[in-house]
């Protein structure tokens, strides 16, 4: 009866995400059969969350909204385990917003999710960012710097990176 | 007042490539990014790509890539448009715009004429 | 790549009748589309953004409504200086396409 009521919690907790992520791949999180985290297919996982590599090339709003309706935002870096981990899907030959920006132009910058900006975990190439009309943040590769952060105009299109919490059932 | 302002009519032959200039005035050049449409004779509108001028940071269409060079002058406020191997498909009115704040095409130039002929 | 499917590619009308022009995208776009007015010789003008939202000193007889793939571009009321030919062009990812045209004309 507990392993029925809780099948049919998981059921209706999948239901939710169908419209956006038709299919999910699950793993048992520690020994218990109990817990499962998801990504949807075929977004990959790290820690507690799921990313999503977005190659259609939109601007730093757009790209924003189309994180957003699939449940997710652009991506907020924490750390640089986090950051190793995400460039491994990346092309060194393009460019990926972040959810980062400076909508005022005044070098406030701030995260999506509005998670405190923290210079200390910041990851400029150096000399940025340099310009107050370029308002949003992408990550990029530099043959001297291999992968870092540069600020540019929002509104030239860009491929990026959506970020989500796991899907927990 | 906002202007764009692009330079005179072309005729080129088959093969060869033109560069169409367009000179922006009434606003701060290095703000708003900078798009390229073309007009085939009597045909609707196709959008060929874009450039910011701050940075020379491009973005084209897929279509044109390979043949279609967009760069900037900041000292003249200027942005240019370079399509190369030129071929009687390219016959056109080219037409470059601004992006405004809203991110739509908010002023455009008066367009140039390219004529491919042999 | 989305596509823009605009319709009708032409029309005939009167003075002061209402004109309603489609425009549909092979996929979801979001809102994030404009209207153009072009008349011959002449750069297209921009008269509506994210669907509905008139562009400065455009007359309020120009409206735009829709959602999704489809969208409506809509004359209340035809003035002589409204035969011209009306674009659609969608800007939610590049590139940034344009619908085929719909040429308004005198009846």
């Known amino acids: 009866n507990f392993m029925y009521s809780k099948t049919v919690k998981r059921l209706s907790k999948l239901r939710e995400y169908q419209q956006y992520h038709p299919s999910l791949t699950c793993v048992m999180e520690g020994k218990d059969i109990e817990d499962w985290s998801c990504c949807p297919t075929p977004w990959t996982s790290f820690q507690s969350s799921c990313y999503f590599i977005s190659t259609g090339m939109q601007s730093w709003t757009k790209s924003q909204k189309n994180c957003s309706v699939m449940g997710a935002d652009l991506v907020v870096i924490n750390t640089r385990e986090e950051q190793d981990f995400i460039i491994q899907n990346l092309k060194r030959n393009s460019s990926y917003f972040l959810g980062l920006s400076d909508p005022g132009g005044r070098r406030h910058w701030q995260w999506v999710d509005q998670t405190p900006y923290n210079e200390n975990v910041t990851f400029w190439h150096s000399g940025e960012p340099n310009n107050l009309d370029e308002r949003c943040a992408i990550i990029n590769f530099r043959s001297s710097e291999e992968w870092g952060w540069n600020d540019i105009h929002c509104h030239v299109p860009q491929k990026s990176i959506c970020k989500m919490k796991k899907i927990y059932i | 007042q906002v202007q764009l302002v692009q330079s005179g009519a072309e005729v080129k032959k088959p093969g060869a490539s033109v560069k169409v200039s367009c000179k922006a005035s009434g606003y701060t050049f290095t703000s708003y990014i900078i798009h390229w449409v073309r007009q085939a004779p009597g045909q609707g509108l196709e959008w060929m790509g874009t450039i910011y001028p701050g940075s020379g940071d491009t973005s084209y269409n897929q279509k044109f890539k390979g043949r279609v060079t967009m760069t900037r002058d900041t000292s003249t406020s200027t942005v240019y448009m370079e399509l190369s191997s030129l071929r009687s498909e390219d016959t056109a009115v080219y037409y470059c715009?601004?992006?405004?704040?809203?991110?739509?095409?908010?002023?455009w130039g008066q367009g140039t004429l390219v004529t491919v002929s042999s | 790549d989305i596509q823009m499917t605009q319709s009708p590619s032409s029309l005939s009308a009167s003075v002061g009748d209402r004109v309603t022009i489609t425009c549909r995208a092979s996929g979801n776009i979001h809102n994030y589309l404009a209207w153009y007015q072009q008349k011959p010789g002449k750069a297209p003008k921009l008269l509506l953004y994210?669907?509905?939202t008139l562009a400065d000193g455009v007359p309020s007889r120009f409206s735009g409504s829709g959602s999704g793939t489809d969208y409506t571009l809509t004359i209340s009321s035809l003035q002589p200086e409204d035969f011209a030919t009306y674009y659609c062009q969608h800007f939610w990812s590049t590139p940034y396409t344009f619908g085929g045209g719909t040429k308004v004309e005198i009846k």
């Open positions: 715009a601004r992006m405004g704040d809203n991110e739509y095409f908010d002023y």
């Open positions: 994210d669907a509905e």
